[in-house]
Amino acid sequence: ASHSGMINPSRQWQTLKQNTGVAHFEYQIRVTCDDYYYGFGCNKFCRPRDDFFGHYACDQNGNKTCMEGWMGPECNRAICRQGCSPKHGSCKLPGDCRCQYGWQGLYCD
């Protein structure tokens, strides 16, 4: 027995039924992507990172989900201390607030 057609990657098993006239076939099939690949064509890649290149996990669709304290398309921008002046403060680590020269205070304001 052979089956021809598109089967999208899924964790669920699909039941296929086939009647050849001589015999009746019923079988279960599933297609899964390789580790860290996602999407209908398994053509999206996401592997969790926590380094210079980004700080993220991956959701069930292969989208990057930033770790707490990080943001941006690659989750490599730190979220500064709440209230940190966007004009006179900045940070490279989450929750930090580093002041520009000439500015001071908890929020560099």
């Epitope: 390789d34 860290y36 690949y37 890649f45 592997r47 380094d51 210079f52 290149f53 980004g54 941006g72 398309p73 690659e74 490599n76 921008r77 490279k92």
Partner: antibody
Framework: QVQLVQSGAELKKPGASVKVSCKVS????????IHWVRQAPGQGLEWMGI????????KYAQKFQGRVTMTVDTSTSTAYMELSSLRSEDTAVYYC?????????WGQGTLVTVSS | DIQMTQSPSSLSASVGDRVTITCRTS??????LTWYQQKPGKAPKLLIY???ILDSGVPSRFSGSGSGTDFTLTISSLQPEDFATYYC?????????FGGGTKLEIK
């Protein structure tokens, strides 16, 4: 569309420094890191380093440590690569490239010739 | 640093041939591998990223496979425009080293 446009060819003497620029357009400059890659005549590709355009942090290949400086000017969406103490072996085409999962976009290349 | 061993360094083939280029890494890089094509006087062109994902606009005769330390670039049926030099590169950790290249020539 995304473009990376590099500065023109340079002829330098041994011991001098060279600064190559890479002006980008077509996307938010600080969203993507910029890498620098070089290729000596008839040779393969050599990765030199990466700069995080948002923070200005850079990481260099060991071979270039102490001789290379990568910087950015976010106001003009331009990345720079400066190589000092030039020697004849530094004669190469220098490329800037954008990306995280490989380099989909490259500059046109800048030929740097080091000769006395 | 992660070492990249690309083979063969040169290869002669004919239009219509199936060609395979391999890249081996000195340590596990998962699927952080990219393949490029370069023609003389031009910047490299991205073909495949994350070991097996075809970049947009790249013909389907190109395919990539492998993970861990062993990777393959396959061209199923060579076309005249495919004669060029091919490079692999890892993007797992710094430095992002390249393989030595494979020059694909017309037989």
């Amino acid at each position: 569309q995304v473009q990376l446009v590099q500065s023109g060819a340079e002829l330098k003497k041994p011991g001098a420094s060279v600064k190559v620029s890479c002006k980008v357009s077509g996307y938010a400059f600080t969203d993507y890191a910029i890498h620098w890659v070089r290729q000596a005549p008839g040779q393969g590709l050599e990765w030199m380093g990466i700069i995080n355009t948002y923070y200005g942090d850079s990481k260099y290949a060991q071979k270039f440590q102490g001789r290379v400086t990568m910087t950015v000017d976010t106001s003009t969406s331009t990345a720079y690569m400066e190589l000092s103490s030039l020697r004849s072996e530094d004669t190469a085409v220098y490329y800037c490239a954008r990306g995280y999962d490989g380099f989909a976009y490259w500059g046109q290349g800048t030929l740097v010739t080091v000769s006395s | 640093d992660i070492q990249m061993t690309q083979s063969p360094s040169s290869l002669s083939a004919s239009v219509g041939d199936r060609v395979t280029i391999t890249c081996r890494t000195s340590e596990n890089i998962y699927s952080y591998l990219t393949w490029y094509q370069q023609k003389p006087g031009k910047a490299p062109k991205l073909l495949i990223y994350n070991a097996k994902i075809l970049d947009s606009g790249v013909p389907s005769r190109f395919s990539g496979s492998g993970s861990g330390t062993d990777f393959t670039l396959t061209i199923s049926s060579l076309q005249p425009e495919d004669f060029a030099t091919y490079y692999c590169q890892h993007h797992y950790d710094i430095p992002w080293t390249f393989g030595g290249g494979t020059k694909l020539e017309i037989k």
